[in-house]
Interface confidence: low
């Protein structure tokens, strides 16, 4: 067991052209928060697949209001770390998704509105207990800088948090056959309960007698490196029967090199051999230029003539990510207006519009009244993809073609008699009432009162009209 910790350093416009507009305004102040999702293995799964290693949500950041005319700065961030506890062994290889969310604080009906501002994803190798690794990721014109690490929760120790340590029973030495538990020199390794011979570096167990393998190792005792020739399906930490990495024991166990860097052991540490375009202790700093062709799926590379000036990939429709490497679920952006149904066909987006609407995004409200006349002097009223007629007095029905009985609704109050008339209706009021609908009682002194009593009160009951 242990905790994955993520520290967001900054979120703001990336270097280079095309600076994004501030997500907040004086009219619509907002604040940021972050979500991290972790999955075991080097999976290329969709953003929506389960966060099998865990997920966490940050606190809300400070409220931010854009200064008119100012470029979008680095935005104020929430305090503290994002912490994702993991119950089992740390897999050594993992995929992450970090989402930046905006909470709009304007006059929203029904509370604040949330919208996804940016999403970055990556695949990394990381040993538990190591130092903070640093990373820079870009999403469109935005740039996110962050650090992360995995640490074990006592009594677990080791690069996978699978070895257990216990306080010494005697002050001077550990029990028979048990080693001191580096780096906790005052503790001893707990007795092993895994299957006999199970590799202490590459295997672990949660039940006595079992031997489950870490990513990259296989065999009954987890002593066989996985073949490097077969990159098959993404795996969880305990199903490493096929795959494509061979982390060795020691410092490279759970390769700490980012961005596809390869790890090689040194006598007391490790070194990362970085792919072209990356550098830094863990290949975490990007020096890629457009000359390296970093944009996938037909993305257009802009800027970045030298390693100090970053490039930006302008992605074609349907792709996103720092390098246009991720297919977008374009329907998640709800592009179809007025309740239209969204269909992502891969090569194009289609909206199936509700009746009364048209256009590529169902943005056009059809003229419902076009070619639809209302009879007998009625007027056509548009609305909701259908038309209706507001009929002249004495007529009703969908097109005002039906002659209406104006007295059908019993419009005369207090027992007044209704008479249909060419101009509408006439009420003959009962004694003591007056008005076009017999709605006002007549006082003995001849003055009329305020409107008639509400239902349930008789005219003689004591009442006050406010």
């Amino acid at each position: 067991a242990g905790v994955f910790e993520l520290q967001i350093h900054s979120f703001g416009p990336g270097p280079g052209p095309g600076a994004p507009r501030s997500p907040c305004s004086a009219r619509l102040p907002c604040r940021l928060f972050f979500r991290v999702c972790l999955k075991p293995g080097l999976s290329e799964e969709a953003a929506e697949s389960p966060c099998a290693l865990g997920a966490a949500l940050s606190a809300r950041g400070p409220v931010y209001t854009e200064q008119p005319g100012a470029p979008a700065p680095d935005l104020p961030l929430p305090d503290g770390l994002l912490q994702v506890p993991f119950r089992d062994a740390w897999p050594g290889t993992f995929s992450f998704i970090i989402e930046t969310w905006r909470e709009e604080l304007g006059d929203q009906i029904g509370g604040p509105a949330w919208s996804l501002l940016a999403r970055v994803a990556g695949r990394r190798r990381l040993a538990a207990g190591g130092p903070w690794a640093r990373d820079i990721q870009r999403a469109g014109a935005w740039e996110l800088r962050f650090s992360y690490r995995a640490r074990c929760e006592p009594p677990a120790v080791g690069t996978a948090c699978t070895r257990l340590c216990r306080p010494r029973s005697a002050p001077s030495r550990c029990g028979p056959g048990l080693r001191p538990c580096a780096p906790l020199e005052d503790e001893c390794e707990a007795p092993l309960v895994c299957r006999a011979g199970c590799s202490p570096e590459h295997g672990f167990c949660e039940q006595p007698g079992e031997c489950r393998c870490l990513e990259g190792w296989t065999g009954p005792l987890c002593t066989v490196p996985v073949s490097t020739s077969s990159c098959l399906s993404p795996r969880g930490p305990s199903s490493a029967t096929t795959g494509c990495l061979v982390p060795g024991p020691g410092p490279c166990d759970g390769n700490p090199c980012a961005n596809g860097g390869s790890c090689s052991e040194t006598p007391r540490s490790f070194e990362c051999t970085c792919p072209r375009g990356f550098y830094g202790l863990r290949c975490e700093v990007s020096g890629v230029t457009c000359a390296d062709g970093p944009c996938f799926n037909g993305g257009l590379c802009v800027g970045g003539a030298d390693p100090d000036s970053a490039y930006i990939c302008h992605c074609p429709p349907g792709f996103q990510g720092s390098n246009c490497e991720k297919r977008v679920d374009r329907c998640s952006l709800q592009p179809c207006r007025n309740g239209g149904l969204c269909l992502d066909l891969g090569h194009a987006l289609r909206c199936r519009c509700r009746a009364g609407f048209a256009g590529p995004r169902c943005e056009h409200d059809l003229d419902d009244c076009a070619g639809r006349a209302c009879a007998n002097g009625g007027t056509c009223v548009e609305g909701g993809g259908a038309h209706r007629c507001s009929c002249a007095l004495g007529f009703g029905g969908r097109d005002c073609r039906e002659r209406a009985d104006p007295c059908a609704a019993r419009p005369c109050a207090h027992g007044g008699r209704c008479y249909a008339h060419f101009s509408g209706l006439v009420c003959a009021c009962a004694p003591g009432y007056m008005g076009a609908r017999c709605e006002f009682p007549v006082h003995p002194d001849g003055a009329s009162a305020l409107p008639a009593a509400p239902p349930g009160l008789r005219p003689g009951d004591p009442q006050r009209y406010l």
């Epitope: 350093h9 680095d74 540490s269």
Partner: antibody, heavy 122, light 107 residues
């Protein structure tokens, strides 16, 4: 302009602790890592560790000092502290704080404090 | 840990001459190497980062080259203010380490 101003010289006895401060100004304090490097008289430079001021728990230490060094920060005063305990005579050195070159990123150090001389003597 | 060996330990040259300082790593450090200048009583100053990337405010006469394990700092034409101690630093693996320094003195 970016400035790192360190506390004054200290004289300590063996076994004691020293706490050196480094006050930052001229940039967004919480966004850049601060590194501590020491230099014994007439000797070269030695990396001790670093801290990310945006989060006090985000630190990396050189294994050589791990059991004796603690780096902390106070965001209200934009100050980073380095405390070294169980001092020995060989800890006599000038202690420098330095800012790393990019937000959250690289490890090269572009701005340095003026240094704090710590003398350990009985 | 990675050991950086600088040579020569002392280099005696005159103003106007070309200086070539060497830094050798005990194992490959890719391009994760930086150069600093230190004058007596002062803090170090970053001259070059990542082997050859220039730093704002540093004169163009300072340049860096190399890869893997062998690196060079070149000062094309020495000025009086260039006489100082020069250190290389690696950021390839923990702990970060510095070379022992090359003292550049006036001949």
């Amino acid at each position: 302009q970016v400035q790192l101003v360190q506390s004054g010289a200290e004289v300590k006895k063996p076994g004691a602790s020293v706490k050196v401060s480094c006050k930052a100004s001229g940039y967004t304090f919480i966004s850049y890592w601060i590194t501590w490097v020491r230099q014994a008289p007439g000797q070269g430079l030695e990396w001790m560790g670093d801290i990310y001021p945006g989060s006090g728990s985000t630190t990396n230490y050189n294994e050589k000092f791990k059991s004796r060094v603690t780096m902390t920060r106070d965001t209200s005063t934009s100050t980073v502290y380095m405390e070294l305990s169980s001092l020995r005579s060989e800890d006599t050195a000038v202690y420098y704080c330095a800012r790393e070159t990019t937000v959250g990123g690289a490890y090269a150090m572009d701005y340095w404090g003026q240094g704090t001389l710590v003398t350990v003597s009985s | 840990e990675i050991v950086l060996t600088q040579s020569p330990a002392t280099l005696s040259l005159s103003p106007g001459e070309r200086a070539t300082l060497s830094c050798r790593a005990s194992q490959s450090i890719n391009n994760n190497l930086h150069w600093y200048q230190q004058k007596p009583g002062q803090a170090p100053r970053l001259l070059i980062k990542y082997v050859s990337q220039s730093i704002s405010g540093i004169p163009a006469r300072f340049s860096g080259s190399g890869s893997g394990t062998d690196f060079t700092l070149t000062i094309s034409s020495l000025e009086p203010e260039d006489f100082a101690v020069y250190y290389c630093q690696q950021t390839q693996s923990w702990p970060l380490t510095f070379g022992g320094g090359t003292k550049l003195e006036i001949k």
